[in-house]
């Protein structure tokens, strides 16, 4: 029999550490799964934000310009209509995500930066101007938010929360990277992460999760965006690359 | 097409108010703030104000607050310009416009 | 508020002429400065827009320039149908407000 679970691999049954895990999942539940993405834009130059009223300019990184955020945001829509099969029945991320406020708002916690814009190509285009100015646009609603995640209106002219569909903030740093201090607006990656439900001793609702993350593979190794390099993983990644180096050996 | 289609001309006797409009087509007033520009004959142009339709939110140039209303109804895609207590000095083209893109004009006449 | 000023208030030239009408902000606008032509009975047209940038369908002849409080736009080798009054305008924020014009006549 070959071992690959990551937790049976790298820690002794009979350990403190394997113990006091035991005892947590037992009494608390697993730790939730976590598919991640890292999104870079290679192909896109950093760029100013002037605002409004004579403000010093502010830097927006490459993966925080406006045509890119949209098209993050149609990736990240597609990942949550990836769908998979487990004993004939229809796996959806919506059927094993993370949603804390349950049953009164069913929404998946996405932590992404597209959820200051409560992940909504209408919202991120919501601006006040006329054709010549703009005083207030995603720029602005932006830097609002990676300083206030938890607010309900950003006080510019926009009004618009920060608050993510799932009823909850979104801290700047786990969305964002290659940031400097706390200047988020340099961020030079963006990071998408879906929390998914883990189960203690309950192996189908385990492989539901897995055949999800399997698509989930799937779809974003062959998908196709020139303006985008994505790196990824599944909670399922180390195990699939310990079964691989398995069968290789 | 982007297009604004101002009013007819008015023909109105001093003390008395009027409302000008002004229908886009080719998009949504509210995607835009919207300007009000005046023109005596044979002067400049100075602006009057402007409305965001989203909210109704407005400002205006002090010289023209009490004088000068300026509405939305986002249903009709139409901004509106009332002017009040029209004088001799209200006797001007008055343009709509969202930057890029004006009205035609309409000519307000005030005489008794 | 900002206020423009423009200059000269006329000017007659010929056809094939270049002219220079200049424009002065009384505080930084930046680049935030449009040209428009207007001729008689006519609404404005825009000609330029953040101080330098053509608007649609406007000839190359016209350019704008200049960033800050000074700014200018010219036209090179006048056509007939080039002749009218030019306003600047400043388009940081608002109030808008409008240079008092220059009418440019056939020499």
């Known amino acids: 029999r070959v071992t690959t679970n990551p937790v049976d691999l790298w820690s002794a049954p009979s350990s403190q550490a394997r113990l006091e895990k035991e005892y947590f999942d037992q009494h608390f539940g697993p730790f939730f799964r976590t598919e991640q993405l890292i999104i870079r834009a290679p192909l896109t130059d950093k760029h100013i934000y002037q605002p409004y009223p004579s403000g010093a300019d502010v830097p927006f990184g490459p993966p925080l310009d406006i045509q890119i955020l949209h098209q993050v945001l149609d990736l990240q829509i597609a990942i949550e209509n990836i769908t998979a099969s487990y004993d004939n029945e229809t796996v959806t991320l919506q059927d094993i995500c993370l949603a804390p406020l349950s049953p009164y708002n069913t929404n998946c916690t996405i932590l992404s930066v597209l959820n200051y814009f409560q992940n909504s190509h209408s919202v991120l285009d919501h601006k006040k101007g006329d054709d010549f100015f703009v005083y207030a646009d995603y720029h602005t609603h932006f830097l609002y938010c990676v300083r206030a995640p938890a607010s309900l209106n950003d006080t510019s002219l926009l009004h618009d929360p920060c608050l993510g569909t799932f009823g909850g903030p979104v801290f700047p740093w786990l969305v964002l990277g290659g940031y400097d201090d706390q200047n988020y607006n340099n961020a030079t990656a963006l990071v998408i992460t879906f929390p998914v439900n883990n189960y203690y001793n309950d192996t189908e609702k385990l492989q539901r999760a897995q055949a999800w993350e399997k698509e989930f593979i799937n779809f974003v190794k062959n998908y196709k965006n020139p303006n985008l390099t994505i790196s990824f993983t599944a909670e399922r990644s180390i195990e699939d690359e310990l079964n691989r180096e398995s069968d290789s050996d | 097409e982007v297009q604004l289609q101002q009013s007819g001309a008015e023909l109105v006797k001093p003390g008395a108010s009027v409302k000008l409009s002004c229908t886009a087509s080719g998009f949504n007033i509210k995607d835009t703030y919207m300007h009000w520009v005046k023109q005596r004959p044979e002067e400049g142009l100075e602006w009057i104000g402007r409305?965001?339709?989203?909210?109704?939110?407005?400002e205006y140039v002090p010289k023209f607050q009490g004088k000068a209303t300026i509405t939305a109804d986002t249903f009709s895609n139409t901004v509106y310009l009332q002017l009040s207590g029209l004088t001799s000095e209200d006797t001007a083209v008055y343009y709509c416009?969202?930057?890029?893109?004006w009205g035609q004009g309409t000519t307000l006449t005030v005489s008794s | 508020d900002i206020q423009m000023t423009q200059s000269p208030a006329s000017l007659s030239a010929s056809v094939g002429e270049t002219v220079t009408i200049t424009c002065r902000a009384s505080e930084n606008i930046y680049s935030y400065l449009a040209w428009y032509q207007q001729k008689q009975g006519k609404s404005p047209q825009l000609l330029v827009y953040?101080?330098?940038t053509l608007a649609e369908g406007v000839p190359s002849r016209f350019s704008g320039s200049g960033s800050g409080t000074q700014f200018s736009l010219k036209i090179n080798s006048l056509q007939p149908e080039d002749f009218g009054i030019y306003y600047c305008q400043h388009h940081y924020g608002s109030p808008w407000a409008f240079g008092g014009g220059t009418k440019l006549e056939i020499k």
């Open positions: 953040n101080a330098k």
């Open positions: 409305i965001d339709p989203a909210d109704g939110n407005t």
């Open positions: 416009s969202r930057g890029y893109y």
